[in-house]
């Protein structure tokens, strides 16, 4: 794993414990909470990051929790079960034996049930819409410059291949970033759009997951782009299965 050899840290995941106990004394990093080895040359899976987040003591949190983001979905925080590859297991249960099915980004896609609930497969989230509203500026950003800047960011910071950024829409002050990645498109080694979206979400909230890298400083031709609210919508390859009672509520 390409962790920084000199001081043995994980550049892409600060929620790790690293030591030079890999083959040949190489630096090896393990995710907090799960103890799973992570590849520090790429993004860590969202499942392992959520598990690490839940394992961190509440009073010794290393990440900032900004107060100005009123739309943080704290209900979405749970201690997930991850498979040996670090992906979400299709069925998640809490300590009171309440279970539900999730998609590949760990978002619930069925009604809650008991231990008899079956989740046959992990359904892939193939389309993510990141909806942002930026703080007021003197004028609108140039659409092409904004578009290019966000595409550059996903390439450089999150290592997401440019083919997976489908579109960037802008109607001041709303910015929408569309990420698309079908199962057939995702090659070995490609960053998952769900992981990239999660890192971006945490960056926007001032809770960067990167080690020893400055926080996100988004600028368009030198003009700061400050986000004041974020909503993320997930579309699955197979539609979710909720009861009509929930849908009409």
């Amino acid at each position: 794993h390409t962790a920084a050899q000199d001081n043995c840290t994980c550049p892409t995941n600060k929620m790790t414990v690293c030591s030079p106990d890999g083959p040949g004394g190489r630096c090896q990093c393990r995710a907090l909470g799960s103890g799973m080895a992570v590849d520090c040359s790429t993004l860590t899976s969202k499942c392992l990051l959520l598990k690490a987040r839940m394992s961190a003591p509440k009073n010794a949190r290393t990440l900032v929790r900004p107060s100005e983001h009123a739309l943080v979905d704290n209900d979405g925080l749970y201690d997930p079960d991850c498979d040996p590859e670090g992906r979400f297991k299709a069925r998640q249960c809490n300590q009171t034996s309440v279970c539900w099915c999730v998609n590949s980004v760990g978002v619930r896609r069925t009604d809650k049930g008991d231990l008899s609930l079956r989740c046959d497969e992990l359904v892939r989230t193939h389309h993510i819409l990141i909806d942002l509203r930026h703080r007021p500026t003197a004028g609108a950003f140039n659409h092409s410059d904004l578009d290019a800047e966000l595409r550059r960011l996903f390439r450089e910071r999150y290592r997401l291949h440019p083919k997976f950024v489908a579109a960037v829409h802008y109607e001041q002050p709303t910015i929408q970033i569309e990420l698309r990645q079908n199962t057939s498109q995702k090659a070995a080694g490609d960053v998952d759009i769900g992981d990239a979206a999660y890192y971006f979400e945490r960056d926007i909230k001032g809770e960067s997951l990167f080690q020893g890298r400055g926080g996100l400083d988004l600028r368009v031709r030198g003009e700061p782009l400050q986000v004041e609210r974020t909503l993320i919508y997930y579309l699955d390859e197979i539609p979710p299965k909720f009861s009509m009672k929930r849908l009409t509520a």
């Epitope: 390409t2 550059r152 290592r159 997401l160 440019p162 600028r219």
Partner: antibody, heavy 117, light 106 residues
Framework: EVQLVQSGPEVKKPGASVKVSCKAS????????IGWVRQAPGQGLEWIGE????????YYTEKFKGRVTMTADTSTSTAYMELSSLRSEDTAVYYC??????????WGQGTLVTVSS | DIQLTQSPSSLSASVGDRVTITCRAS?????MYWYQQKPGKAPKLLIY???TLASGVPSRFSGSGSGTDFTLTISSLQPEDFATYYC?????????FGQGTKLEIK
């Protein structure tokens, strides 16, 4: 095999325009980015800008904005860079380079553009 | 714009020598990239993500650094290594290159 093949050398008069082509093969053209870099004789590398081939999104550096136009023809997998209002200091080798999760992973062979009266 | 300053600008060395080229950024960057260019040829990607060798690059090349200070090291110079080396960043637009370091035979 990934290849970027550029058009041949050009000699232009000051004030004229030049259009350099970059024909790609060996990869899915619209999945990538083509960046343009120039190198004046005996000098270093200077980035001009880039075009996202799938969306047509373009970013030009401030220095070249207004004088450069980047386009792509997806039917022939060819990217183009046109520079107008040429002056003698635009004499350089112009390179196209493919971008992915790296800024430039494969480069064209370069096109020498000479601006002389 | 982020300025990259390479040192030295030129360097004379012999086959078998250990050579280090430094690249200093005017503000912090995430990663540094290094390219090798031989006369009349296009640049070739040598090192990406500060320290990872590009495909086919010999292990005598290595890269290190973080923040604003980065280095390219050639542990034992070979005849084919005499070329010009450039560092480059893309942590922010516009992408910028160092002015280059010309490595010549002593």
């Amino acid at each position: 095999e990934v290849q970027l093949v550029q058009s041949g050398p050009e000699v232009k008069k000051p004030g004229a325009s030049v259009k350099v082509s970059c024909k790609a093969s060996g990869f899915t053209f619209t999945d990538y980015v083509i960046g343009w870099v120039r190198q004046a004789p005996g000098q270093g590398l200077e980035w001009i800008g880039e075009i996202y081939l799938g969306s047509g999104t373009i970013y030009y550096t401030e220095k070249f904005k207004g004088r450069v136009t980047m386009t792509a023809d997806t039917s022939t997998s060819t990217a183009y860079m046109e520079l107008s209002s040429l002056r003698s200091e635009d004499t350089a080798v112009y390179y196209c380079a493919r971008g992915s999760i790296f800024p430039f992973d494969y480069w064209g062979q370069g096109t020498l553009v000479t601006v002389s009266s | 714009d982020i300025q990259l300053t390479q040192s030295p600008s030129s360097l004379s060395a012999s086959v078998g020598d250990r050579v280090t080229i430094t690249c200093r950024a005017s503000s912090s960057v995430s990663y540094m990239y290094w390219y090798q260019q031989k006369p009349g040829k296009a640049p070739k990607l040598l090192i990406y993500d500060t320290s990872t060798l590009a495909s086919g690059v010999p292990s005598r090349f290595s890269g290190s650094g973080s923040g604003t200070d980065f280095t390219l090291t050639i542990s034992s110079l070979q005849p084919e290594d005499f070329a010009t080396y450039y560092c480059q960043q893309w942590s922010s637009y516009p992408y910028t290159f160092g002015q280059g370091t010309k490595l010549e035979i002593k």
